[in-house]
Amino acid sequence: PEPPTACREKQYLINSQCCSLCQPGQKLVSDCTEFTETECLPCGESEFLDTWNRETHCHQHKYCDPNLGLRVQQKGTSETDTICTCEEGWHCTSEACESCVLHRSCSPGFGVKQIATGVSDTICEPCPVGFFSNVSSAFEKCHPWTSCETKDLVVQQAGTNKTDVVCGPQDRLRA
């Protein structure tokens, strides 16, 4: 028969014959022959391969370096890489999460729209009219101005995006 020019899924062409790829978690040791199947062996304890492959070396699991603020979110297996995340108060600088930076704080006049996670930074928003934030914080939202009326008081000093209103007693009309 004619030697193949293409092979089925999960196979590869070598020496004019189709050999089975090694399954995820295993590396290639020797190609198949006309008498034997592909020889594969498992990846080591700190290694992985996540696809059907013909790799002769497994990949090393990612190291979550605590000096960079990283910790293990999910331990790697022979078929998956380790997933790193950041320590509390820090977030990844990239999708690959190779290092961490401190969560950003929202300055006075801005409130937290979305609290940071291990993989995303704090999202701040300017405090709209009627709201304020007088602190730099990674958690505080914009607070509504105090309602003087509900306290039977009147506004003595208008609020801003950084300050609350100041309430005071109503002027009494003299009889």
């Epitope: 020496n15 040791v29 020797s30 022959t33 008498f35 304890e45």
Partner: antibody, heavy 117, light 114 residues
């Protein structure tokens, strides 16, 4: 043709050194683990060691071979080597070059090494 | 190093006999065991790999079984061309960095005509 051809055997004095070569052809040398196996006259097979596939293939040896024998390869020349130092009379054997690790799919014809004064 | 203990060292049998050869590993090797046949003046020939997989072109009268430490090669009906020496090969594969890969052959079993 898929084959392994050993060379470099011969008579050597005790304490001497010898380098065996194994020329591989007909298959992708770079993606196959390669082993050395020896057989003393009239005796059984004895595993010497292995070099795994890939450019920086790891090597492993039988405990008796560690420190005296070294396996290496030149992928560009599709050639496997066995460097043997501090040879002893008990190293007299036919040395086979072989393809595979947990099972050997291809053997060379062997080269005879005789250690004698 | 791993040690493979093969028995018997020799056996005499007749054509048509059922022959069994055993091999024991000094530590668990999973299914990393192969069987070879060798005739005088020739290189060994692979018969069985992964403990029980028959190499292509090898007659179906040859079969292998076992895992861990105990393995068996069976020739269901001995043929004239089967008189030879048989070897098992065990392979200890390490997935840790503290131990090393090693392999060993059994001492061999010579099958002779009764």
């Amino acid at each position: 043709e898929v084959q392994l051809v050993e060379s470099g055997g011969g008579l050597v004095q005790p304490g001497g050194s010898l380098r065996l070569s194994c020329a591989a052809s007909g298959f992708d040398f770079s993606s196959n683990a390669m082993s050395w196996v020896r057989q003393a006259p009239g005796k059984g097979l004895e595993w010497v060691g292995i070099i795994y596939a890939g450019s920086s293939g790891s090597t492993y040896y039988a405990s008796w071979a560690k420190g005296r024998f070294t396996i290496s390869k030149d992928t560009s020349k599709t050639t496997l080597y066995l460097q043997m130092n501090s040879l002893r009379a008990e190293d007299t054997a036919t040395y086979f070059c072989a393809r595979g690790a947990t099972y050997i799919t291809l053997w060379g014809q062997g080269t005879l090494v005789t250690v004698s004064s | 190093d791993i040690v493979m203990t093969q028995s018997p060292s020799s056996l005499s049998a007749s054509v048509g006999d059922r022959v069994t050869i055993t091999c024991q590993a000094s530590q668990s090797i999973g299914s990393y065991l192969a069987w070879y046949q060798q005739k005088p003046g020739q290189a060994p020939k692979l018969l069985i790999y992964r403990a029980s997989t028959l190499a292509s072109g090898v007659p179906s009268r040859f079969s292998g079984s076992g895992s861990g430490t105990d393995f068996t090669l069976t020739i269901s009906s001995l043929q004239p061309e089967d008189f030879a020496t048989y070897y098992c090969q065990g392979y200890y594969y390490s997935t840790t960095t503290t131990t090393y890969d090693s392999s060993a052959f059994g001492q061999g079993t010579k099958v002779v005509i009764k």
